[in-house]
């Protein structure tokens, strides 16, 4: 005998509270196939989530985030502030990058400058807070008389180490 | 679509135990959370862990749970995973799998549970 | 860590009586509440969701409210059937390191 609730399409349900006819899902649920029993509870997209895709009868809602913030987590199961280019997100807020790391996106942590000389380099371009370092030619590559450019180690600046 | 719970079973204290959690009916490709839900006898529903069976596999856990308890998947299978270790008396349950498409906690679709009891 | 609180943790009420279920959370939650019945040696039963939406295949004769922290379910005439217990969850997903999830201690409803 084949199974009455094979017959209901995606966006109904079987139910067994009315002999098993298939029933439109209730409103903010869907069913993605056909022959379910239950449907499925849409995703809402409230607060700080900003609706992507829309929920139908059939499919799930999407979501994204509000300007100045972005998505993180499965399915954007979580929306996380914005800062600015070097910049890192604590528990206190966006705090600039430490002297010696840099954060060169809206999102993430602040890392170490990349260490030139571990790969026998010079440093080329000084490392700020947005950008890392650039490491120039190893010294022996130098032309006699060429000076890689070695700036004098600067003042630390204050830092915010992540809460 | 159905979830079925096995796996459970007495164990000493201290011991090991992994429950699986087998999904039909759909696919773990879908854009499902699914969750472990405990409930000791006589006692209300305890939140466990959760996976996202969609691409990133992104896992979160009860404080109860974290350090002792690992959720994973197995997407070939359509099983869902519990590796319990350290058991404790307390850890004895009836353990539940349920699907949430909401992303709030919000469970349409329940296994029967499987039952876990911690014992000398 | 979210709390969910519910009373009362027994009812004693007659078939077609109409029954309210308190729930309230230890911060706003929005309407990211559920309701779930459930029965000696079964799984939960989803009911509500959102705090007020209707799960398929449940009787109108349940319904549900509230927002925030405070949130009623209430059964506008017991039926045989209905006597069970009930449970409340609230939650969202926000950090591994941080996440929220919770089931009141449930309210048992009984025959008078």
């Known amino acids: 005998l084949q199974d009455p609730c094979s017959n209901c399409p995606a966006g109904t349900f079987c139910d067994n509270n009315r002999n098993q006819i298939c029933s439109p899902c209730p409103p903010n649920s869907f069913s993605s196939a056909g022959g379910q029993r239950t449907c499925d509870i849409c995703r809402q997209c409230k607060g700080v989530f900003r609706t992507r895709k829309e929920c139908s009868s059939t499919s799930n809602a999407e979501c994204d985030c509000t300007p100045g913030f972005h998505c993180l987590g499965a399915g954007c199961s979580m929306c996380e502030q914005d800062c600015k280019q070097g910049q890192e997100l604590t528990k206190k807020g966006c705090k600039d990058c430490c002297f010696g790391t840099f954060n060169d996106q809206k999102r993430g942590i602040c890392r170490p400058w990349t260490n030139c000389s571990l790969d026998g380099k010079s440093v080329l371009v000084n490392g700020t807070k947005e950008r890392d370092v650039v490491c120039g030619p190893s010294p022996a590559d130098l032309s006699p008389g060429a000076s890689s450019v070695t700036p004098p180690a600067p003042a630390r600046e204050p830092g915010h180490s992540p809460q | 679509q159905s979830l079925v719970e096995s796996g459970g079973g007495l164990v000493q204290p201290g011991g090991s135990l992994r429950l699986s959690c087998a999904a039909s009916g759909f696919s773990f490709s879908s854009n499902y959370w699914i969750c472990w839900v405990r409930q000791a006898p006589g006692k209300g529903l305890e939140w466990i862990a959760c996976?996202?069976?969609?691409?990133?596999?992104?896992?979160y856990y009860a404080s109860s749970a974290k350090g002792r308890f690992t959720i994973s998947r197995d997407n070939s299978k359509n099983t869902l995973y519990l590796q319990m270790n350290s058991l404790r008396a307390e850890d004895t349950a009836v353990y539940y799998c349920a699907r949430d498409s909401s992303s709030y906690y919000m469970f349409n679709l329940w296994g029967q549970g499987t039952l876990v009891t911690v014992s000398s | 860590a979210l709390v969910m609180t519910q009373s009362p943790s027994t009812l004693s009420a007659s078939v077609g009586d109409r029954v309210t279920i308190n729930c309230q959370a230890s911060?706003?939650?929005?309407?990211?509440l559920a309701w779930y019945q459930q029965k000696p040696g079964k799984a939960p039963k989803l009911l509500i969701f959102y705090a007020s939406d209707l799960a398929s295949g449940v009787p109108s004769r349940f319904s549900g409210s509230g927002s925030g922290t405070e949130f009623t379910l209430t059964i506008s005439s017991l039926q045989p059937d209905d006597f069970a217990t009930y449970y409340c969850q609230g939650g969202y997903y926000t950090s591994s390191a941080d996440t929220r999830g919770a089931f009141g201690g449930g309210t048992k409803v009984e025959i008078k």
């Open positions: 911060e706003d939650i929005d309407t990211y």
């Open positions: 996976i996202y069976v969609g691409s990133s596999g992104d896992t």
